[in-house]
């Protein structure tokens, strides 16, 4: 279960890494993998990567999609390879939701 406390020696998973935070790497290792989409000053920014620390991803992964950001998380080797985060399909435009970042 997602709410379970992490074990003392938590399992690390290999995750696909895409986006600015990855540098030249195409993968990373962490306790959770993620795939995200955010609207940043009008641009759609896609990122994939990992949360090294369980607590780091806990709140982010529980955040429901908003008009400006969506994050999907998973646990398992390469589990984010075929996951593409999608914004909720409500309406066409996004005035007022210009700056969202996945920190």
């Amino acid at each position: 279960m997602e709410d379970e406390k992490p074990k003392v020696n938590p399992k690390l998973y290999m995750c696909v890494c895409e986006g600015l935070s990855c540098g030249n790497e195409d993968h990373c290792e962490g306790q959770q993998c993620f795939s995200s989409l955010s609207i940043n000053d009008g641009f759609h920014v896609y990122q994939k990567g990992c949360f090294q620390v369980y607590e780091q991803g806990k709140m982010t992964c529980k955040t429901p999609p908003s008009p400006g950001q969506a994050v999907e998380c998973c646990q398992g080797d390469w589990c984010n390879r075929n996951i593409t985060a999608q914004l909720p399909t409500k309406g066409k435009s996004f005035p007022g939701t210009q700056n969202f970042h996945l920190e």
């Epitope: 609207i39 940043n40 641009f43 759609h44 896609y46 075929n82 999608q86 914004l87 066409k92 435009s93």
Partner: antibody, heavy 121, light 108 residues
Framework: EVQLVESGGGLVQPGGSLRLSCAAS????????MSWVRQAPGKGLEWVSA????????YYADSVKGRFTISRDNSKNTLYLQMNSLRAEDTAVYYC??????????????WGQGTMVTVSS | EIVMTQSPATLSVSPGKRATLSCRAS??????LAWYQQKPGQAPRLLIY???TRATGIPARFSGSGSGTEFTLTISSLQSEDFAVYYC??????????FGQGTKLEIK
């Protein structure tokens, strides 16, 4: 109705300059990143440049970097492309385009009709 | 830069038949791929986004599939108005946004 209308194309000599405009209507202009995409006669589509909604971030294809400048005036709902040091290979129809439906994830679903730029002596 | 490669360059198919167009990315673009249709003298028209979802107003005979590096656009029963040039484009890793070189679909 969401609409993009380009203007400013024409015939220019190699080394010359030209400024293209794209007038937008029907949406909140400042919320959208916008791009220029070009198509040389008989060739495919080539992304040229993009600018963020506020105008604070700009991006260019390597083929135009240092020669073209993208800008926008959000008070006039207008996108610009300043083209300097023009070359014969810049000859193309220039389109402005936006990913209007935000749930389309960045695909360009709104395009202008295009404006033709011919670079020739 | 991600390179998009389309095949074939030209496809000749009879009206009423099925057409299958391919697009390959030099590295994964997840499902962040679009297909466009362009007719002579017109601007491109978005057909498919997210690799497999039809844009508003696009007929059901158009379908997209694939993820990662291999993508396919299928037109199930070709109508006369479907003969045009088709482009794929990735919007996963930018800049630059990159397009394939196009596939010309012509009447056999």
């Amino acid at each position: 109705e969401v609409q993009l209308v380009e203007s400013g194309g024409g015939l220019v000599q190699p080394g010359g300059s030209l400024r293209l405009s794209c007038a937008a209507s029907g949406f909140t202009f400042s919320s959208y990143a916008m791009s220029w995409v070009r198509q040389a006669p008989g060739k495919g589509l080539e992304w040229v440049s993009a600018i963020s909604g506020s105008g604070g971030s700009t991006y260019y294809a390597d083929s135009v970097k240092g020669r073209f400048t993208i800008s926008r005036d959000n008070s006039k709902n207008t996108l610009y492309l300043q083209m300097n040091s023009l070359r014969a290979e810049d000859t193309a129809v220039y389109y402005c385009a936006i990913p209007y439906n935000w749930n389309y994830g960045g695909a360009f679903d709104i395009w202008g009709q295009g404006t033709m730029v011919t670079v020739s002596s | 830069e991600i390179v998009m490669t389309q095949s074939p360059a030209t496809l000749s198919v009879s009206p009423g038949k099925r057409a299958t167009l391919s697009c390959r990315a030099s590295q994964s673009v997840s499902s962040n791929l679009a297909w466009y249709q362009q007719k002579p003298g017109q601007a491109p028209r978005l057909l498919i986004y997210g690799a497999s979802t039809r844009a508003t107003g696009i007929p059901a005979r158009f379908s997209g599939s694939g993820s990662g590096t291999e993508f396919t656009l299928t037109i199930s029963s070709l109508q006369s108005e479907d003969f045009a040039v088709y482009y794929c484009q990735q919007y996963n890793n930018w800049p630059p946004y990159t397009f394939g070189q196009g596939t010309k679909l012509e009447i056999k």
